[in-house]
């Protein structure tokens, strides 16, 4: 098993609809054909798994049906989108990439993307 460099943006601001997107790029030492991508959230020294997908190179990322994540891959880049975020979900989102095949197994962990989520202000009552 070997280590691998993973790059991701330092900061992302979620949209008013609670959607945040960022790119996770890994420095693959070879031509991986099976890759597993996991998004972890670190807050208050606790690490929890947000979502994960295993994909064959050239195919779409497939997250579980009830996942809050979607994504696409292009070469050594994965474009990740997390939806349904609220202010309480603000935190450090870490991209983890595992090259499962061919051997050897590689593991790469990014430094994390700080995602800021601001709940939208409720619309004021308006007179018609």
């Amino acid at each position: 098993c070997k280590a691998m460099h993973v790059a991701q943006p330092a900061v992302v601001l979620a949209s008013s609809r609670g959607i945040a997107s960022f790119v996770c790029e890994y420095a693959s030492p070879g031509k991986a054909t099976e890759v597993r991508v996991t998004v972890l959230r670190q807050a208050d020294s606790q690490v929890t798994e947000v979502c994960a997908a295993t994909y064959m190179m050239g195919n779409e990322l497939t997250f579980l049906d009830d996942s809050i994540c979607t994504g696409t891959s292009s070469g050594n880049q994965v474009n990740l989108t997390i939806q349904g975020l609220r202010a309480m979900d603000t935190g450090l989102y870490i991209c983890k990439v595992e090259l499962m095949y061919p051997p050897p197994y590689y593991l790469g962990i990014g430094n994390g993307t700080q995602i800021y989520v601001i709940d939208p202000e409720p619309c004021p009552d308006s007179d018609f």
């Epitope: 098993c1 972890l40 690490v47 798994e49 994960a52 295993t54 499962m100 095949y101 061919p102 197994y105």
Partner: nanobody, 119 residues
Framework: EVQLVESGGGLVQPGGSLRLSCAAS????????MGWYRQAPGKERELVAD???????NYANSVKGRFTISRDGAKNTVGLQMNSLRPDDTAVYSC?????????????WGQGTQVTVSS
Amino acid sequence: EVQLVESGGGLVQPGGSLRLSCAASGNIFSRYIMGWYRQAPGKERELVADITPGGNTNYANSVKGRFTISRDGAKNTVGLQMNSLRPDDTAVYSCYARGSDKLLMRTYWGQGTQVTVSS
């Protein structure tokens, strides 16, 4: 807690067949590479075969065409079908699982099962 429990070892004649099985407990089966290593007396441990969550397989040259690895997601087991066994296949066969848990790389091992090929 993750546990790997092997079964199916034993004594077999040259040219015979055996099937090893490894049952995995804990939430690793769908996320980890799983496979088999073996160690013969006085020799280094060597990879026999492994299989990824996506079903990609990898074999040692010495077992290609004779051994077949498979995984059963419904039972959380990994099997190793060993055909055309030879005396130099005699070893302790250990199941392993390799992957990561949150931010840490992990490798888990079973206790091992003895396979002896002898007439």
